[in-house]
Interface confidence: low
């Protein structure tokens, strides 16, 4: 009779993580008598995966009934495959011996590769806020995918970015891989509503790439512009001076009025108006009693925004002129700013 052959028909199989893998093995003869065992790897360090006769292998089931007398199919199914299960599996026939069975013949091996989906990309921005015109870095990470082939793209508001560096680790063979990418983004004043998107494409995600996003509202600080204007006279001896705080983000803002360098009033921004681009405007006014001043008054609007050093703008109120004249020389509203920057 022809000598027994151990046939593993599949040179390699590729299975998605979480699926079951079927490893095929048939023998061509019932002789010699003896069990079949499955191993991962070869040589002295090989790992026993299944032993027909003894042991507990909870994830392994046999495809056919091994108790049948004429059974020659020793295929096994391994459930809930993870990337750690990757490797070459050998179906090995043993000859009955005393006290131990003797290895008789091995199949050629089946290489199991595991396809695992990448985790959802996590995008993180800088720890501190930055102002427009500055370049900030965003990182994107995704883990646990296999095979190693993967593509990563960066977008800002749907426009693809080109200034980024990507690494896939480890460089050599591994059961699964991670990707890490850093993109550089130049901030503009209009970026409060902007989004940075990291898009990962992998063969396990065909047609449906994974995306991670970061809102630039978490990253950007748009400093305010200040405008101090003198409004028309309300009463004979009173002048209304307004400080318009425009286009700032985030909302956190404190304003202090100074008269000739002395603190007159401090207030925290409330009832802000939001612009289309996501920035905010706020207005504060100061009613100045001109009759209480003998000399010209320097009014300063000082703004501390988001914990940054204060910025200020001043307005010189001339007391010598009659208030009514002064009012008539000043156009109403914020269109005319009789203000001098510090």
């Amino acid at each position: 009779e022809e000598e027994l052959q151990v046939i593993q028909p599949d040179k390699s199989i590729s299975v998605a993580a979480g699926e079951s893998a079927t490893l095929h093995c048939t023998v061509t003869s019932l002789i010699p008598v003896g069990p079949i065992q499955w191993f991962r790897g070869a040589g002295p360090g090989r790992e026993l995966i299944y032993n027909q006769k003894e042991g507990h292998f909870p994830r392994v089931t046999t495809v056919s009934d091994l108790t049948k007398r004429n059974n020659m199919d020793f295929s096994i199914r391994i459930s809930n495959i993870t990337p750690a299960d990757a490797g070459t599996y050998y179906c090995v026939k043993f000859r009955k011996g005393s006290p131990d069975h003797v290895e008789f013949k091995s199949g050629a091996g089946t290489e199991l590769s595991v396809r695992a989906k990448p985790s959802a990309p996590v995008v993180s921005g800088p720890a501190a806020r930055a102002t427009p015109q500055h370049t900030v870095s965003f990182t994107c990470e995704s883990h646990g995918f296999s095979p190693r082939d993967i593509t990563l793209k960066w977008f800002k508001n749907g426009n693809e970015l080109s200034d980024f560096q990507t690494n896939v680790d480890p460089a050599g063979d591994s059961v699964s891989y991670s990707i890490h990418s850093t993109a550089k983004v130049v901030l503009t004043r209009e970026d409060v509503h902007s989004q940075v998107i990291c898009e990962v494409a992998h063969v396990t995600l065909q047609g449906d790439p994974l995306r991670g996003t970061a809102n630039l509202s978490e990253t950007i600080r748009v400093p305010p512009t200040l405008e101090v204007t003198q409004q028309p006279v309300r009463a004979e001896n009173q002048v209304n001076v307004t400080c318009q705080v425009r286009k700032f983000y985030p909302q956190r803002l404190q304003l202090t009025w100074l008269e000739n360098g002395n603190v007159s009033r401090t207030e925290t921004a409330s009832t802000l108006t939001e612009n289309k681009d996501g920035t905010y405007n706020w207005m504060s006014w100061l009613l100045v009693n001109v009759s209480a001043h003998r000399d010209d008054v320097k009014l300063t609007c000082q703004v501390e925004h988001d914990g940054q050093p204060a910025v200020s703008k001043s307005h010189d109120l001339k007391v010598s002129a009659h208030p009514k004249e002064q009012g008539s020389n000043t156009a109403p509203g914020p269109a005319l700013a009789s203000a001098a920057p510090l």
Epitope: D10, V15, A16, S20, T22, I81, T151, V203, G207
Partner: antibody, heavy 129, light 110 residues
């Protein structure tokens, strides 16, 4: 709506070259295998080549290996088949098609259970002197 | 390479007939087998994918099945618009990169 439109076919002399285009709309070719399949007059379907542009994967039938080059331009959402050293037996209608798998997987054999779900109308290539 | 042997190469049938077309794979393959219908001068149309799943919009008289290495397309009750050529197709590589077609079966009016 998913659409594939081939162009670039025509009459060419043996040994000549042609470049076929397959313009896709309604989906992003970056994330799909695009295949070229040909059909000689009165004959059956013959697979020619496939490309998965995101990973730069390209595959060819033995009959065209070394003569044909498949590629894709994701910015134009278009796949191409550059055909060099053309022979009379390359005369055929050339179709491009999208390969899709609906998430089903055969763990037994390690294969996605996919198919060519959308095809173009085809473009005729005639190689004759 | 895996070969897909399709039979018969042609058949004559009448409206209302039950028609069966078979494709045999040259070796053990996955269920990544699809069936297509092609009419003269037109591109093929997908009917069945994954050996037995009916593609959307395809009439339920079409069905697919598998037995070992044999894959079968059945038309339960042939309609006038079903006279066409049918092809089986196997996606060989695990991501569907390589494709093999059967030789085709022409279904003609008896």
């Amino acid at each position: 709506e998913v659409q594939l439109v081939e162009s670039g076919g025509g009459l060419v002399q043996p040994g000549g070259s042609l470049r076929l285009s397959c313009a896709a709309s309604g989906f992003n070719i970056s994330y799909y295998f695009i295949h070229w399949v040909r059909q000689a007059p009165g004959k059956g379907l013959e697979w020619v080549a496939s490309v998965y542009s995101s990973f730069g994967y390209t595959y060819y039938a033995d009959s065209v290996k070394g003569r044909f080059t498949i590629s894709a331009d994701t910015s134009k959402n278009t796949a191409y088949l550059q055909m060099n050293s053309l022979r009379a037996e390359d005369t055929a209608v050339y179709y491009c098609a999208r390969f899709t798998f609906p998430g089903l997987f055969d763990g037994f054999f390690g294969a996605y259970l996919g198919s060519l779900d959308y095809w173009g109308q085809g473009t005729l290539v005639t190689v004759s002197s | 390479d895996i070969q897909m042997t399709q039979s018969p190469s042609s058949l004559s049938a009448s409206v209302g007939d039950r028609v069966t077309i078979t494709c045999r794979a040259s070796q053990s393959v996955s269920s990544a087998v699809a069936w297509y219908q092609q009419k003269p001068g037109k591109a093929p149309k997908l009917l069945i994918y994954s050996a037995s799943s009916l593609y959307s919009g395809v009439p339920s008289r079409f069905s697919g099945s598998r037995s070992g290495t044999d894959f079968t397309l059945t038309i339960s009750s042939l309609q006038p618009e079903d006279f066409a050529t049918y092809y089986c197709q196997q996606a060989v590589n695990w991501v569907g990169a390589l494709v093999t077609f059967g030789q085709g079966t022409k279904v003609e009016i008896k």
